[in-house]
């Protein structure tokens, strides 16, 4: 249940199945609120949010990104392809969300909440996509070595990586939110 729903909403007669559009939407918005809080700490702590050297760090990252071929944009929209992309992308983001743990001081709980809420969102979407079998799960060994590599970076690159993950995840979720409205 997205913590964005208060108890009287949960008890209300219109309580919806977990896969309903409204519940999925609330879950995404809850995660976006969490990202916003984490970005605030990142931007306050370092000048990464204004940095023009993002390309340096981006070379090390392979963050999920929506492209035309994924069918999630208004032009060339494809419901099935897009839903697969959203779920696959969220699964790929999980290793980066794991990296974000321990990267925050005052927002440690928020970072954990974003990670756990994303797991719940993936479950919601997998239920919605129960007939789709084109969803590939990232290889755990590859993820483990990626995590080790990211954690071995110098401080500046770690700060930049944190900033880029949050920014990319926000953009990915915003695109997902729009696309899911047409499903």
């Amino acid at each position: 249940v997205p913590p964005g729903e208060d108890s009287k909403d949960v008890a209300a007669p219109h309580r919806q199945p977990l896969t309903s559009s409204e519940r999925i939407d609330k879950q995404i918005r809850y995660i976006l609120d969490g990202i916003s809080a984490l970005r605030k700490e990142t931007c306050n702590k370092s000048n990464m949010c204004e940095s023009s050297k993002e390309a340096l760090a981006e070379n090390n990252l392979n963050l999920p990104k929506m492209a035309e071929k994924d069918g999630c944009f208004q032009s060339g929209f494809n419901e099935e392809t897009c839903l697969v992309k959203i779920i696959t992308g969220l699964l790929e983001f999980e290793v980066y969300l794991e990296y974000l743990q321990n990267r925050f001081e005052s927002s440690e709980e928020q970072a954990r909440a974003v990670q756990m809420s994303t797991k719940v969102l993936i479950q919601f979407l997998q239920k919605k996509a129960k007939n789709l079998d084109a969803i590939t799960t990232p290889d755990p060994t590859t993820n483990a070595s990626l995590l080790t590599k990211l954690q071995a970076q110098n401080q500046w690159l770690q700060d930049m990586t944190t900033h880029l993950i949050l920014r990319s995840f926000k953009e990915f979720l915003q695109s997902s939110l729009r696309a899911l409205r047409q499903m």
Partner: antibody
Amino acid sequence: QLQVVESGGGLVQPGSSLRLSCGASGFTFSSHRMYWVRQPPGKGLEWVSAISSSGVSTYYADSVKGRFTISRDNAKNTVYLQMNSLKPEDTALYYCKRRTWYGGEYDYWGQGTQVTVSS
Amino acid sequence: QTVVTQEPSLSVSPGGTVTLTCGLSSGSVTASNYPGWFQQTPGQAPRALIYSTNDRHSGVPSRFSGSISGNKAALTITGAQPEDEADYYCALDIGDITEFGGGTHLTVLG
């Protein structure tokens, strides 16, 4: 020029069937969830049904569930509403509309098609 | 079934400001309900004004604005014009369906 044109309405007896069509043009039809909304004479708007962009998911108001079926043909840019077991309370002007992607888009409503169920 | 509530009627003086609200019989309206507002004058098809809480549709005058205030969605008309006299409907996405409110008849006095 964005346009939706509803057709297929008419006067029918209770218990009979009718199929409404909505032809759309001027936008990428297959990228939009589509709706049917109705308005009984002198009353307010009532959402009836919706269909996802590909047609894989359909949604219905409780008042029509089990009687109405929404479908679409993206090759023909058309959405349909098959209405069975019609009741006098289904009498209304039926509108078809798209779900927009962004607020800045123009959200067009057609003139609707009149359905009258009476003996 | 959840009922979407609106004031049956409101009035405003020309040039004045009026706020129409849209609530749920149980629970609060949130951005995930994508509050939308529609205007309808007699004999005409509805016209969409606001999408997703506060996005004005193309061609809608800036005097119309949407928001969520407290536990309700709201439509505010600032500097009401005689042509704003009409029925106003709100729509909320609830679960997988959409529900319209019963409508508010707005009278522009004078």
